[in-house]
Every structure is written in C-alpha cells, then in structure tokens.
Interface confidence: medium
C-alpha cells in the first residue's frame, strides 16, 4: 500500500494549527470498517491518533490531535495537530493498513518568529570618543536558535568582541542576547539583526551613538525615533533617556509617562520614590538604572489596546520630555484552504477556494497567485474581523473557473512583522480530487 | 546622476607600484564606503579592500594587505588605490565601487569602468 | 573566511528555458547580493538584501533561501540574461565572492 506524505518538514509557528498531510488510494468498494491507521511519534513509537474497526479512536497526544473524518474515506488521512509547541518538534509516522499495509513519515519543523530586538547601552552617559562601550541586543520568544550579524552604520560586518547567548523558557522558546563591545568613534550606528533560519525572518534595530555632552539648559530627553514594536503577549521596553549632570541625585528627579494622546497617567517616580503603575498594573522603571539617566518604562504582557504613544516627562531643575510609539503586533497562522464544492470537479466548473488566518495584527495584506506566479485579483472578497482582544482572523474568498488543472496559493502578510504566511492548493483530475500543498 | 569615474589603463613593470584613481561625482563622498575589487582576465571578481573617506578606517583582504594603501582625498572626492610590488599575476582589471543601502542591507550599487592594469617586464 | 561556491560554472540555456544557479555559503550570511557583468563591462547590482530585485531587473528573476544555500532563478530566459552573474556576502571579512556561474545561449 503506497502511503504519500510531504517530503520537505512541514513548519508551523508555535500557538497554531498544523496538518501533517499523509494521503492513500483507496480501491473500489473500500469501506472505513476495512481501515487501521494510526499515526505514532517515529523515534519513541508513542501513540498519537487512531481509527481501527470503523471508529476514530481519538487523540492519545494531549488532546490535541484529530484527525479529518469526512476525508478518510478518500484516503486522506491527514493529521490535524492543535497549538504546536516547541516540544511537538520531530518526526511522525502515518502508518495505514486495509489489507496490505504502508508506513511514511513526515517531519514537524516547529518555528516562532523573534520580537524586535531591544538595545541597551552602558555606559550610556557623559560618553566620548575613545570610550569602550557594551551595547546588547536582546530578542524574545524565537524558535530555533537565532542567527545574530552586527554591523556598523556603513554596513561593515562587526565579528570581534561580539558574545552571544541564547537561552530557552519553559515553552522552549529562546531569548537571545548579543553584546557587542565597541570602541567609539566620533559617531557611530551599531545595527544588530536577529534572523530566524527556519522562516527566514530578519528582526533588526539599530543605536547611534553621538559622545558629546548636550547642552546645558533644558533636560535632553532621548527616546527611539521608531516605533517599538512588542508582540502581543510579550513584554515591551520604550527607552527613553536623559543625561544627569554631576551630583545628581533621585530626589530631584520628577519622571512621568503618560499616554500621548490623552494623557492619562501611565507610571511616575516622585519625591525619591517609585510611585507606581496607573496603568492595569502592567508597567515598571528600572530602579537600579534611573540615577544613570534611564527612565525607560517596561509595558507587560502588551494587548493590541497599548498601541499608540507614550511621553516620557523628565523634570530635574529644567525639564524636558519625548514621546515613543508603540506598536503592536501578531503574527497570522498558517492560512487553512478550503473548496467548495469539493468533489466531482470539471474543468469549466466554478468553484470558491476560501483562505483563512487567525489572530494577527495589524491588518493583513492578503494576495493571491496562480502556480504560475500569476497574481489573481479579480473575484477575490477578504474580510478581516477582530476579536475581543483586537487580534484579526482573516477570510478571503477566490472565485475561480477551474481550467484542466491548476494551484491557487494565498499569502497572508503582517505589513509590520513583514510576516509571509502561505497555504496553497492544488486542484487536478477528471473528476478531479483536491489537496493541501503547504510550503 | 551617480558616478564613479577610474583613471586610465597602465602598463608597468615587475616589482614597481601603481596607484589608480577614482573620482566620485553626485553624492556625499563621505558618506559611504568605497571598496576596491579586481578580476584577472577570464577570472572572477576578488576584493582587495575597503576605505570609509569618513573616518578614513580601511580594511583589507589579508591577501593583499602588506601591498596595498587605500587613501581617499575628502577635497576632491577621489579614492586611491596603490599596489606595489607588483607581479604578472596582478595584471587585471581594477574596480572602485560604492557600498551602499541602508541598514541593515548593504550592496555595491555604482561601479566604476575599470581600470585596466598590465604587469609586463 | 565565508567560501561562496556557485554551481554550475557554466550552462548553455535556449530562450524561454527556466534556469537555476545556486550560490552556497560555507556558513550562515546575514544577506547575500547579486550581482551580472557582461564582458567588457563593469558588474551591475541585480539582487540585494538576499532577494530584492535592483533598479531595472526584470521580474522574471527570483532569489529564494534553504539554509545555507541561495538559489537565483530566471523563469524564463531572455536573450539580454546572457551574461556572469556573482553572488556576494559580507557578514564577515573578507568580503567574498563566488566564482561566477557563466549564462550562454545556445
């Protein structure tokens, strides 16, 4: 029995939904009660999912498995696995018997996309030419291991006294930091980019260093010229900074952040003390860091709801004050296809390809091509509906006339993570059959 | 419009030096790294190094690194390239080019025509 | 050093066909960039950033990524694609190049 799974590992981003494809051809008369498959994790032979003696025997895998009922009966028995995690990682065996029997194996590549990075400086006062300095990249929540590169603001690769380390939570997923120590120059841009291997994300920031002392009068308050960019769930840092003059001390310093727009009150350091977070209880300073000038304020568990900008107030004698965009994001699954109608196909016949994503943000962009490459933009309908904590699921509707065979692909892209998620299908036959290509 | 313009083809003689010009027009010279590469007939292409006229930082190809000087003369907005100790195998063709981008993606966007370089005894 | 080997050296292509050069990395890039020379002339930027198309590259040139290993496809040759085309990284010195895959038309 000739049993047909993907060859290249199928990749899944933590949190959502996989399909480890396996598909068999079915004989005339074949009937369910005839059919054993088991799926099983190949190198332990543990038990995943089952259908014997006509019935689905269920999920034997945390209860996140099933399997695609309707399907079976036309040899799909594919795998649907639910909010991969970083330990699903591996390879499963779809074995299946009738009366003769066949085994394949198709490999889960599990990945997670690495957050903005956020960079640290220290010294980060009263700094000159001819200064050593270490400035840290740090980026969260990735899988697998990152691939860090540093350059200098003229793209000149930086390799030397670069120390990077990466260290895995309790989810698996890494956080990484790289510090770079550094001579300064005159002035200086120092870029960091964090690349994930397996989906090919680039996540970069950059710091210019300018050592010279600000101007004495006003307080120079100094925050990112971009945007923060914080995935939802994670935490976020908007720096902001100020150069303490000579025996300084934190009894002078008044700190407020505050919402931009409408400014209610965020955080605030008053009369030598932390006076706490107005803010759902979800923001902290850096208490050890103030007296050295950093007044960055940490924003928790970020919802789609924190975006927008915040002002840091820095007031010693004079004062002076910047603001800082946050903005948030999430990436959109992996986009599931679905046909209708889905049997008995002609060419000639019409038939709606729906591509679905779940809980991204911002808005998607969604595209759709040919097996050509072809864009199709004609009879497409997407609509986008946020949820109650403002994340987006995403369904857009292809109309097409089905030639003698063709591949419809859609490309589910987060415009700020410049995320690409993609799912295609395949349509071929008389009558034709369909199936999922996952890329 | 962009330009890098090369001085004119030499010939010279084994274990003397050359050095090659190149005129940069319609930027900021200082702005960016100028690097200097060489192909060898019917050969490929080889970086001998790179000079920022900025900082004046120069780094080379550790190939090439006891032989070669980059210098960029800010006033005039040229960069240099002088070889010395020259050998038949240097005969080639010289290339200044521009590297330029934004971070964090860099690329030689403007080349020079060449400057063509024949060792001869 | 990073070696960049381009495979194949050289390859005799009809019009419409689609060809294929691979450039490999001897380790990871941050970025790799393209570049075509026809002779007698001074190499053109044509990829950069890994898979941006330069100023004037025809979209039937395409990069994409496996690892290591970064494959430039041209879906259907032209005449004009005639020409060497280099891969090229600096993710750490020495800036290198590869050797140059050679496009003839038969």
């Known amino acids: 029995l000739e049993v047909q799974v993907p060859e290249d590992p199928v990749v899944a981003l933590v949190g959502t939904d996989a399909t480890l494809c396996c598909s068999f051809s079915p004989e005339p008369g074949f009937s369910l009660a005839q059919l054993n498959l088991i799926w099983q994790l190949t190198d332990t032979k543990q038990l995943v999912h089952s259908f014997a003696e006509g019935q689905d025997q269920g999920s034997a895998y945390a209860n996140r498995t099933a399997l695609f009922p309707d399907l079976l009966a036309q040899g799909n028995a594919s795998l649907r696995l639910q909010r991969v995690r970083v330990a699903d990682e591996g390879s499963f065996t779809c074995f299946v018997s009738i009366r003769d029997f066949g085994s394949a194996a198709v490999s889960l590549q599990v990945a997670a996309p690495y957050s903005k990075p956020s960079m640290t400086l220290e010294p980060n006062k009263d700094l000159r030419p001819g200064d050593t300095v270490t400035i840290t990249c740090s980026s969260y929540q990735g899988y697998p291991e990152a691939e860090v590169f540093w350059q200098d603001g003229q793209g000149v690769p930086l390799t030397g006294n670069v120390t990077t380390s990466q260290m895995a939570n309790e989810q698996g997923l890494f956080d990484v930091h790289s510090i770079l120590r550094v001579v300064l120059g005159a002035n200086g841009t120092y870029s960091c980019l964090v690349r994930n291997p397996v989906l090919q994300q680039d996540a970069h920031s950059s710091v210019t260093i300018t050592p010279q002392r600000s101007p004495t009068g006003a307080v120079e308050v100094q925050v990112p010229e971009d945007p923060v960019v914080a995935l939802v769930g994670t935490d976020a840092t908007l720096r902001c900074s100020f150069s303490p003059e000579p025996g300084f001390s934190l009894a002078q310093l008044n700190l407020i952040w505050q919402l931009t727009d409408t400014k209610q009150l965020v955080h605030s350091f008053t009369e030598g003390r932390d006076q706490g977070s107005a803010y759902a209880n979800r923001t902290a300073l850096f208490p050890d860091l103030l007296a050295q000038g950093n007044a960055s304020l940490r924003l928790q568990r970020v919802r789609v709801a924190d975006e927008g900008s915040f002002t840091c107030f820095v007031s010693i004698r004079d004062f002076g004050s910047a603001a800082v965009s946050l903005q948030v994001a999430a990436p959109y699954s992996k986009p599931s296809m679905t046909l209708e109608p889905n049997k008995d196909l002609r060419p000639g016949d019409t038939v709606t390809i729906t591509c679905s994503s779940y809980r991204g943000y911002p808005e998607a962009e969604v595209f759709w091509q040919d097996g050509q490459g072809v864009p199709l933009t004609g009879n497409v309908t997407t609509s986008q509906m946020a949820n109650e904590q403002g994340l987006f699921d995403v369904h857009s509707v292809l109309r097409v006339v089905l030639g003698a065979n063709g591949t419809y692909s859609c490309l589910v892209r987060n415009p700020v993570l410049q995320q690409d998620a993609h799912g295609s299908v395949t349509i071929t036959g008389q009558p034709m059959t369909h199936h999922h290509h996952h890329h | 419009e962009v330009q890098l313009v090369q001085s004119g083809a030499e010939v010279k003689k084994p274990g003397s030096s050359v050095k090659v010009s190149c005129k940069a027009s319609g930027y900021s010279f200082t702005s960016y790294t100028i690097h200097w590469v060489r192909q060898a007939p019917g050969q490929g292409l080889e970086w001998i190094g790179y000079?920022?006229?900025?900082?004046?930082?120069?780094d080379y190809n550790q190939k090439f690194k006891d032989r070669t000087t980059l210098t960029a003369d800010r006033s005039t907005s040229t960069a240099y390239m002088e070889l010395s100790s020259l050998r038949s195998e240097d005969t080639a063709v010289y290339y200044c080019?521009?590297?330029?981008?934004?971070?964090?993606?860099?690329?030689?966007?403007?080349w020079g025509q060449g400057t063509t370089v024949t060792v001869s005894s | 050093e990073i070696v960049l080997t381009q495979s194949p050296d050289f390859q005799s292509v009809t019009p419409k066909e689609k060809v294929t050069i691979t450039c490999r990395a001897s380790s990871s890039v941050s970025y790799m960039n393209w570049y075509q020379q026809k002779p007698d002339q001074s190499p053109k930027p044509w990829i950069y950033a890994t898979s941006n198309l330069a100023s004037g590259v025809p979209s039937r040139f395409s990069v994409s990524v496996s690892g290591t290993d970064h494959t430039l496809t041209i879906n259907s040759l032209e005449a004009e694609d005639a020409a060497t085309y280099y891969c090229q990284q600096w993710s750490s010195n020495p800036l290198t190049f590869g050797q140059g895959t050679k496009l003839e038309i038969k």
């Open positions: 080019a521009r590297y330029s981008g934004s971070t964090p993606y860099w690329y030689f966007d403007v």
């Open positions: 000079i920022n006229p900025n900082s004046r930082n120069t």
